[in-house]
């Protein structure tokens, strides 16, 4: 956030940039959390995303019995590996075709034992507050489907009647990693020393990191005709003075008519 300064007062402004702001010759360049001519104001909302999508990765092992292991399979640039990868990917795309979150597979290692395939199943879903549940459900369906196919597609009388055949007992789920996204934590971190006063509120399933000085949310502080300003002790209302009234009180809701005060003073004089 930047505020431009024109005229003779600018040199003075340069040395007065606050809160880590830097002078660029024309204006104070403010760090993310601040704005204003001197970076003296604290922002009332912080952009915390969310990411458009959340990913999960399942580390799986299956044993393919319809391909004979050779040392060439360890070399990822060999024709053996490339052809195996093509067929394995095609097979897995068929296995997981009913899972909307399924993105693909990535072979990490092939080793002896017919062919033991260490691979990742990649899942992705659009961000919603329920993303954990969505991905948890998807990982369960992956487990069911891979268990089913490795039980059904097996060699019978040394013949494989499918694209690939498997050893039923060679199927294992090693690890499941879901990209962590915690808007509350992100909000607290990005608000730094003001973290106690910033909260996450949702609108259209999107999280907003806001302080009570941001209008239009359930936590918003109503300063009436005053201005909400964030300080290290929390949000405060800075009350205004108009031509006719002084305003005071925690939410600037107490107005005193100047004429009454002046009249009162005049009466005393």
């Amino acid at each position: 956030r930047t505020t431009t300064c024109f005229g003779d007062g600018c040199q003075n402004t340069a040395s007065r940039c606050k809160n880590g702001g830097t002078w660029d010759g024309l204006k104070c360049q403010c760090p993310n959390l601040y704005y204003g001519e001197l970076c003296e104001e604290v922002v009332s909302s912080i952009d915390i995303g969310p990411p458009e999508t959340i990913s999960a990765q399942m580390e799986l092992t299956v044993t393919v019995t319809s391909v004979k292991f050779t040392e060439e399979l360890k070399n990822h640039s060999s024709q053996e590996f490339q052809e195996f990868k093509q067929t394995f990917t095609e097979q897995m795309n068929i296995v997981y075709s009913g899972i909307p979150e399924y993105v693909g597979v990535n072979i990490t290692k092939l080793r002896l034992g017919s062919v033991v395939v260490e691979h990742d199943v990649l899942l992705r879903t659009k961000y919603t507050p329920e993303y954990k549940t969505v991905l948890d459900n998807a990982t369960e369906v992956v487990k069911e489907k891979i268990t089913k196919v490795t039980t059904q597609q097996i060699m019978i009388n040394d013949i494989c009647s499918d694209m690939m055949c498997f050893n039923t007992t060679g199927t294992q789920v090693q690890n499941i990693t879901v990209t962590q996204y915690d808007p509350e934590e992100d909000c607290r971190k990005m608000a730094k020393e003001y973290g106690d006063y910033f909260v996450v509120e949702y609108r259209d399933q999107k999280p907003y990191c806001i302080s009570p000085c941001e209008p239009g949310f359930s936590v918003s502080k109503n300063c009436n005709l005053g201005k909400c300003q964030m300080s290290l002790s929390g949000p405060q209302c800075l009350c205004v003075t108009t031509e006719t009234h002084w305003y005071s009180g925690e939410t600037c809701n107490q107005g005193t008519q100047k004429s009454l005060v002046y009249g009162h003073h005049h009466h005393h004089h």
Partner: nanobody, 124 residues
Amino acid sequence: EVQLVESGGGLVQPGRSLRLSCAASGDITRRCMGWFRQAPGKEREGVAGISEDGITGYADSVKGRFTISRDNAKNSLYLQMNSLRAEDTALYYCAASILNRVGCRQLSYEYIYRGQGTMVTVSS
């Protein structure tokens, strides 16, 4: 990448014979090889398959009439077709599996490379 080119197709009378050949551009030694066919308006169908060590498999409709063979030294595959019938009319494709495929049979699941095909028409 393996390139496969079929030859030997043509018009033949019922009961006669035909020999199809398939020339491969690369080494086919460690591959299952096979033939499948597609008749006009019908689904693709596995005809015959042969493993790298010469074990063969056939579709029920061609058993006893067709013979698949391979010549690894020449990188070639053959299909000897005897006692041809009108229902054998189709486009015949040669196919190759991934390297080191085991447990082959005549169906086409295991094949990742295939040729353009050669037309066989059985008609009197």
